[in-house]
Interface confidence: medium
């Protein structure tokens, strides 16, 4: 209690001033449950038996609500996409109660994080992407998606990052709000693919035989699984995989004084076949 | 209230191009994923194209892949077919719908705006 | 490609009697997920499409529960079980399990008799 000290001035019957001071013991007056929780935050967690939501409310005591729909500040069985009113109160603070309208959002099973990248160019990118697999009556408008990838943040139900590092591991978090409360989470961590190998070096490429030529090479740095040479003679065109070890390659059964183009490339079968870049050479058999 | 209206059909000459418009309103157009499906006259239904709620996807079937294109633009609640090298066979209306997501199902289509190749 | 085959094509009903189409799918349907993404839509004469059922058997809400779908694996069924004057139109099978490509029916006219 405060002690609240109030003067009062009266005339008395003579006419005289007469000052008197009366001391009361006063409460501070309580705030209204309404004003109190009027900015409680809740937390949705989904039971995976039951299907059903519990909502923890987010205060420091222990409150009550009406007709003891809730136990450790926790409402419990919640079915996805009602709403649900309680009435807080605690005896710290006065009527009127706190009318919360808890706003459930739909089940957790029903959502998915798929990988959306294109086997093609996941050497390079990815995709995630949020999917929705099972019907719920809440209002879609009131979903939001998140993702962070790194210090990048895309509030987007799919994402796509670009201009990656092949055989790279990224991690990504995302999470799912229904009216700004989140409801879900899901980390995803995805390796780029193997990137396209690089460019062989050739070393040197030259006939010395009438019906035989011979072509040397450096291998790329990165990852591979075999070469590819192929070599033309005006239109026709011959290719042979050669075993990934082999620096070194002799063309038998060339025909005379022609020219022969050969390429030469590494290629990985990774998600999907990805050839490196062919290095180019050339030269003309002797003459029988 | 959700709503999604075509428009920019219209008469072209085979080869021709035309650019059809989609304006979504009244839901959260960036969590659909959208098709454009097409109904020649007298005839039936024929899905043309599908976007991923982001973009990222797109999808068509072989009778126009290569000649049409799907875009959205989410910011501005829109999508976008792009028909180049047009045939007589394209005649059609054509209609956008939302797909919640690619395993979902077409619960709202616009009224369709009608495209006419002929010479 | 998946093709979705319906019959009949023409289906004249006496109002108040029932109606039955059939959907049969060139291969079979059901998606890795364990999942049937079969659905039917109905288009009354100058109107788009309508969702009518989806997931093979689900009833789309504000639809009257006069029309059922049933079926598996490769054979779908849309029974109406008293038909009114409103449902005249076309109604259209369509598979959504092979993705990208979707496929509709070729459409099954229903009349009144």
């Known amino acids: 209690a405060y002690l609240n000290a109030s003067e009062t001035t009266t005339l008395s019957p003579s006419g005289s001033a007469v000052i008197s001071t009366t001391t009361i013991a006063t409460t501070p007056s309580k705030p209204t449950c309404d004003e109190k929780y009027a900015n409680i935050t809740v937390d949705y967690l989904y039971n995976k038996e039951t299907k059903l939501f519990t909502a923890k409310l987010n205060v420091n005591e222990n409150v009550e609500c009406g007709n003891n729909t809730c136990t450790n500040n926790e409402v419990h069985n919640l079915t996805e996409c009602k709403n649900a009113s309680v009435s807080i109160s605690h005896n710290s603070c006065t009527a009127p109660d706190k009318t919360l309208i808890l706003d459930v959002p739909p089940g957790v099973e029903k959502f998915q994080l798929h990988d959306c990248t294109q086997v093609e160019k996941a050497d390079t990118t990815i995709c995630l992407k949020w999917k929705n697999i099972e019907t719920f009556t809440c209002d879609t408008q009131n979903i939001t998606y998140r993702f962070q990838c790194g210090n990048m943040i895309f509030d987007n139900k799919e994402i796509k990052l670009e201009n990656l590092e092949p055989e790279h591991e990224y991690k990504c978090d995302s999470e799912i709000l229904y009216n700004n409360h989140k409801f879900t989470n899901a980390s995803k961590i995805i390796k780029t693919d193997f990137g396209s190998p690089g460019e062989p070096q050739i070393i040197f490429c030259r006939s010395e035989a009438a019906h035989q030529g011979v072509i040397t090479w450096n291998p790329p740095q990165r990852s591979f699984h075999n070469f590819t040479l192929c070599y033309i003679k005006e239109t026709e065109k011959d290719c042979l995989n050669l075993d990934k070890n082999l620096i070194k390659y002799d063309l038998q059964n060339l025909k005379p004084y022609t020219k022969y183009v050969l390429s030469l490339h590494a290629y990985i079968i990774a998600k999907v076949q990805r050839n490196g870049s062919a290095a180019m050479c050339h030269f003309t058999t002797k003459s029988a | 209230q959700v709503q999604l209206v075509e428009s920019g059909g219209g008469l072209v000459k085979p080869g021709g191009s035309l650019r059809l418009s989609c304006a979504a309103s009244?839901?959260?157009?960036?969590?659909?994923?959208m098709s454009w499906i097409r109904q020649a006259p007298g005839k039936g239904l024929e899905w043309v194209s599908y976007?991923?709620?982001?973009?990222?996807?797109?999808y068509y079937p072989d009778t126009v892949k290569g000649r049409f294109t799907i875009s959205r633009d989410n910011a501005k609640n829109s999508l976008y077919l792009q028909m180049n090298s047009l045939r007589a066979e394209d005649t059609a209306v054509y209609y956008c719908?939302?797909?919640?997501?690619?395993?979902?199902?077409?619960?709202?289509w616009g009224r369709g705006t009608l495209v006419t190749v002929s010479s | 490609d998946v093709v979705m085959t319906q019959s009949p094509l023409s289906l004249p009903v006496t109002l108040g009697q029932p109606a039955s189409i059939s959907c049969r799918s060139s291969?079979?349907?059901?998606?890795?997920?364990?999942?049937?993404?079969l659905e039917w839509y109905q288009q009354r004469p100058g109107q788009s499409p309508r969702l009518l059922i989806y997931?093979?058997?689900n009833l789309f809400s504000g639809v009257p529960d006069r029309f059922s779908g049933s079926g598996s694996g490769t054979d779908f069924t849309l029974k109406i079980s008293r038909v009114e004057a409103e449902d005249v139109g076309v109604y259209y099978c369509f598979q959504g399990s092979h993705v990208p490509m979707y496929t509709f029916g070729q459409g099954t006219k229903l009349e009144i008799k």
């Open positions: 976007i991923s709620s982001g973009g990222v996807s797109t």
């Open positions: 997931k093979v058997s």
């Open positions: 291969q079979s349907i059901v998606h890795s997920n364990a999942k049937t993404y």
């Open positions: 719908a939302r797909r919640y997501d690619v395993w979902w199902y077409f619960d709202v």
């Open positions: 009244g839901f959260a157009f960036s969590n659909y994923d």
